[in-house]
């Protein structure tokens, strides 16, 4: 079953390579377990950036080596991606699955274009 997912169209990463955005889904029921996946689309290639499964009201748990962190509040997921560089500029798509209880729902956002600008190196001081 399909579900609507909303996310901002554009986000500019900070000078430290951190980008945050909210992924909001229109839950048709009372889900207790949710899976969130962030995918990056660039040059028609899609790669998985990170994924987390969480129980409603609890922290999102990403893998130890994940570049993502996040918190949830109701039907909103606040996602933060760190360690970004200019080459990571691309469309970051939020995918939400309501895993439990049945029925299963899947929603895919239109994507957030994240722009990353590498900071200029500081000039050497004499």
């Amino acid at each position: 079953k399909a579900m609507h997912v909303a996310q901002p169209a554009v986000v500019l990463a900070s000078s430290r390579g951190i980008a945050s955005f909210v992924c909001e889904y229109a839950s048709p029921g009372k889900a207790t377990e949710v899976r969130v996946t962030v995918l990056r689309q660039a040059d028609s290639q899609v790669t998985e950036v990170c994924a987390a499964t969480y129980m409603m009201g609890n922290e999102l748990t990403f893998l130890d080596d994940s570049i993502c962190t996040g918190t949830s509040s109701g039907n909103q997921v606040n996602l933060t991606i760190q360690g970004l560089r200019a080459m990571d500029t691309g469309l970051y798509i939020c995918k939400v699955e309501l895993m439990y209880p049945p029925p299963y729902y899947l929603g895919i956002g239109n994507g957030t274009q994240i722009y990353v600008i590498d900071p200029e190196p500081c000039p050497d001081s004499d």
């Epitope: 399909a2 995918l39 998985e48 994924a51 895919i108």
Partner: nanobody
Framework: EVQLVESGGGLVQPGGSLRLSCAAS????????MGWFRQAPGKGQEFVSD????????YYADSVKGRFTISRDNAKNTLYLQMNSLRPEDTAVYYC????????????WGQGTLVTVSS
């Protein structure tokens, strides 16, 4: 056109085991993910398990964790679901599904195979 064909369903006693297979044909097997869903009579579609090829990560519904194991054999273009310690509440039609890119949703579905757990 990709086709998914499930097999391995049948009647089994509580506590018994079954292994479901899902053979993919007609296209590439390099899916982003493949999974198993089930639907019991009069109930909504339930996620059972899936495997994401990029990282080889597996996910399971709490109701089957520790009892079911998902795996795939790329050489045979086949996805498996090993089901142990079966319970009457596992009775359902089990469907195999495949996802091409991760942002397209579950693109392909099998026709389903019936699993009945009863004494």
């Amino acid at each position: 056109e990709v086709q998914l064909v499930e097999s391995g369903g049948g009647l089994v006693q509580p506590g018994g085991s079954l292994r479901l297979s899902c053979a993919a044909s007609g296209g590439t097997f390099s899916f982003y993910g493949m999974g198993w869903f089930r639907q019991a009579p009069g109930k909504g579609q339930e996620f059972v398990s899936d495997i994401r090829t990029s990282a080889g990560r597996t996910y399971y519904a709490d109701s089957v964790k520790g009892r079911f194991t998902i795996s795939r054999d790329n050489a045979k273009n086949t996805l498996y679901l090993q089901m142990n310690s079966l319970r009457p509440e596992d009775t359902a039609v089990y469907y195999c599904a495949a996802e091409m890119s991760g942002i397209s949703g579950w693109d392909y579905w099998g026709q389903g195979t019936l699993v009945t757990v009863s004494s």
